[in-house]
Structures are given as C-alpha cells and as structure tokens.
C-alpha cells in the first residue's frame, strides 16, 4: 500500500510515557522539506482502524481520524516546516498505551518510525515529619500513581538498611477509580539524618528526600521517567 518510485527519508521517534489525565507528547522528527504544502504527517496506532491524526497541505485533515482520538490531538503546525511531526495528545487515557507509527511523506520521499507509548500515573512525593505520631515519624505522600508502585525507604546514615519492618505503606484509590494515592509512614526516625522515600513502577521513579536536623528541615523531590529519553 506504499508509494513507489520515491526515496525514503529518515524519521525518528522517541519512546515516551503519558500521565493519565494530563497532556502528553509523542515525539517524531523528520528530514524537513522547503514547502509546507508538500508535507503529509500521519499518526497511526496499532489496534485502531482510523488515523490518530493527519496533517496535510498545511492543516489538519480530520475526516479519517478515529473517534477514540477526536478532539485530543494536535501537531505543532509552526514547527512542521523544520521537521517536527510530534503529536500533542490531550487528556491521556490508560487505553492510549501501545505502538504508534509516525508516517511522513514529503517531496523528497517517505518514511516512518514506530514509537512505544506507555501510560500510567506518576507524581512527586512529599515527605513531612508527622508530629501527630507518638514517636518520630515521617510521612511520604504522592497523590497519583498507576500501576501500583513499590515504595522503599532509605537513609544516608544507615545505607543499605532495610526499613520494611519499620514502615507501613497504603494505597488509596482516587475518585476516578484508576489512579491511587500512595502514603508511606516510616517509624523510629533519628535526627540529623537524610531519609529518602522512593516510589517506582514500570513507568516512573520518584524520590522524596527529607533532611531532619535540630534546627531545620530540608526537602527535595525528583521524578524520572523510565525507558524513555523524554
């Protein structure tokens, strides 16, 4: 079903992950063309009959778009001329996960590349001192995760120590019945130490650090997507 008699062009994609309920980007670049009207961008998804998105003759062409993606997709129209075919996907859904194809036609030729898109939920954890507890206790909370992550505590002073016996983790389903709130409590905390709460699933890894001294409390959070250069 392809075009015959044309050269192939280089199309490059980057595997990425989308956060359910938020907007995501499916990255795709190609060898640019000098005329916007000669560029056709088509996004397809395995398991979907219609197109995810189509951009041709300088504008969106949505008559072939599958209803699953209606009203949720856009290309960066002003960047197409410089070889950016990335797709913005609004309100990412769990079912958006899968294999996508970025298919490009220009006056130079055609090319395509696949992209694996993972979907889930991930959020920054916040670690606080729980002053309501009977002993020195830390509470690590992250509002949205899916699939269910693992939670591991670590400390700077007791490196390599296993805190599973002195911590308790719970998962509370959020109102949309997909994502969950993660709460982990660490007991018997000592002063003048830095503790890390590490939350991880197959999509993302997040760390919340807290440094507790007699005079101050310092916090830091970090989130990293896994298997992704995004």
């Amino acid at each position: 079903f392809g075009i015959s008699g044309r050269h192939s062009i280089t199309v490059t994609t980057v595997a990425s992950a989308g956060n359910i309920g938020e907007d995501g980007i499916l990255s795709c670049t190609f060898e640019p063309d000098i005329k916007l009207s000669d560029i056709v961008i088509q996004w397809l998804k395995e398991g979907v009959l219609g197109l995810v998105h189509e951009f041709k003759e300088g504008k969106d062409e949505l008559s072939e778009q599958d209803e699953m993606f209606r009203g949720r997709t856009a290309v960066f129209a002003d960047q197409v001329i410089v070889g950016n075919a990335s797709l913005r996907l609004k309100n990412v859904q769990l079912t958006d996960a899968g294999t996508y194809k970025c298919y490009i036609i220009t006056s130079k030729g055609k090319g395509n590349a696949n992209l694996e898109y993972k979907t889930g939920a991930f959020s920054m954890p916040e670690v606080n001192v729980d002053y309501n507890a009977s002993s020195e206790t830390l509470r690590c909370e992250a509002p949205r995760w899916f699939p269910q992550p693992t939670v591991v505590w670590a400390s700077q002073v007791d490196q390599g120590a296993n805190f599973s016996e002195v911590s308790n983790t719970s998962f509370e389903l959020n109102s949309e019945n997909v994502t969950m709130k993660v709460v982990s409590v660490l007991y018997n905390v000592t002063i003048n130490n830095t503790y890390s709460c590490m939350i991880e699933n197959d999509i993302a890894k997040a760390t919340g650090d807290i440094k507790v001294t007699e005079s101050e409390i310092k916090r830091r959070s970090h989130l990293q997507l896994l298997n992704s250069k995004a």
């Epitope: 392809g2 009959l49 219609g50 055609k110």
Partner: antibody, heavy 115, light 113 residues
Framework: QVQLVQSGAEVKKPGSSVKVSCKAS????????INWVRQAPGQGLEWMGG????????RYAQKFQGRVTITADESTSTAYMELSSLRSEDTAVYYC????????WGQGTLVTVSS | DIVMTQSPDSLAVSLGERATINCKSS????????????LAWYQQKPGQPPKLLIY???TRESGVPDRFSGSGSGTDFTLTISSLQAEDVAVYYC?????????FGQGTRLEIK
C-alpha cells in the same frame, strides 16, 4: 490517481466461503483503512468492516462478527475479505472502499450464493 | 449503532427543477468541539459503485458540480440539487462517519418527472 481493483464474480454454494480481493494502486494506502461494504440486489449499502493495512488491525460490524475476516498484504497492496457459512441472503455486490470517508471505491464483486 | 433514515424513498422531479432529499440520524453526528457534522452524501448510478458528493454535511468533494449542496446539523440533514440534470438520475445515500460502525441511510431514488 487512486484505483481499487477487485477480483471477479463468484458463484458459491450455501455453507461455503468466498474470498474477495481488492488491489490498490496510485497512492499511499497503508495508512488509510480499507473498508468493505456490501449491497444486496435492489438494496442499500451495508458496512461490513475494515482494516488498517499498516498494522493489520481489523474491525467488524456486529452482524458479521465471527463470519467475516478482513486481511491485508502490504507487499502486494491488496486487501481481502473472506465471508464464511454463506447463505442465499449473502448474495450481493461486495465493494472495497478506501478510508473512513469512502472517497475511492472498487468496481464491486458480485457474489451469488445458490444451491 | 446510529440509524440513518432518509426521506422520501423515491422522488420524481422535472429537469431544471430543485430536488431535495432529507436524512435523519438517530443521534447527533455533530462534534461540538470542532463544530463539524460527520455526515456524507453519496450518489450511485446503476451498475456503478457509489461516488462521494459531500462530506462534513456541506463540503463538496472536488469535481462535484455546484448544483449539489448539503445543509443541516446535529440530526437533520438535506441534500439539494438546485437544477436537476438528466445525469443526476441515481440513488442517493447519506452516511454517518461519526462512530464505528459506519452506517448508511436506506437510499433515495431520484427520477425525472
């Protein structure tokens, strides 16, 4: 110019199967769905299902689920529609059509089911 | 599934006169975010496959004479031929492509009076 060329007329016995082909030329087809639409004598148009040739993803109308199989061979730019357990009511002209919006059609293949 | 119902089933109109065919969908085919109606009209002449005339309810396909026009929104649509020509004798179908399965109206046969 886009062209869809279908295989020739078929006469089949009740209970047997028929496989109709649709060869595409003159454009980029692997990205657009190839749909199959049938028309019984003197009747209207009925969507049977379609396939995304690039991924081989097929979708079928509920009425034909389990009886129809739509496939595509990218190397030959050909889509196929196989209908099994044929009955006399399946006597119809079967069309392939490109895209969700059927801009391009095959010429049609008459399938006659008769004992 | 969305059910498409056309009226009338058949229509006889004099050459040069206006022909009007109606199509009603069992649910709206208007997508409010882009204000587009996912409705198309096809013409089918005897022994031929259907031919796309109009999509988005009112956009003429390239090469279609301007005597053909489409109108309507939501659930009620109309195909109008402003001045009937002999070559317009055919069966006309409306089609919704809002959701899968794609569905067609039962067709309207247009003849010359």
């Amino acid at each position: 110019q886009v062209q869809l060329v279908q295989s020739g007329a078929e006469v089949k016995k009740p209970g047997s199967s028929v496989k109709v082909s649709c060869k595409a030329s003159g454009g980029t087809f692997s990205t657009y769905a190839i749909n199959w639409v049938r028309q019984a004598p003197g009747q209207g148009l009925e969507w049977m299902g379609g396939i995304n040739p690039m991924f081989g993803t097929a979708r079928y109308a509920q009425k034909f689920q389990g009886r129809v199989t739509i496939t595509a061979d990218e190397s030959t730019s050909t889509a196929y529609m196989e209908l099994s357990s044929l009955r006399s009511e399946d006597t119809a002209v079967y069309y392939c059509a490109r895209g969700r919006l059927h801009r391009h059609w095959g010429q049609g293949t008459l399938v006659t089911v008769s004992s | 599934d969305i059910v498409m119902t056309q009226s009338p089933d058949s229509l006889a109109v004099s050459l040069g006169e206006r022909a009007t065919i109606n199509c009603k969908s069992s649910q709206s085919v208007l997508y409010s975010s882009n204000n587009k109606n996912y409705l198309a009209w096809y013409q089918q002449k005897p022994g031929q496959p259907p031919k796309l005339l109009i999509y988005w309810a009112s956009t003429r396909e390239s090469g279609v004479p301007d005597r053909f026009s489409g109108s309507g929104s939501g659930t009620d649509f109309t195909l109008t031929i402003s001045s009937l020509q002999a070559e317009d004798v055919a069966v006309y179908y409306c089609q919704q492509y809002y959701t899968t399965p794609i569905t067609f109206g039962q067709g309207t046969r247009l003849e010359i009076k």
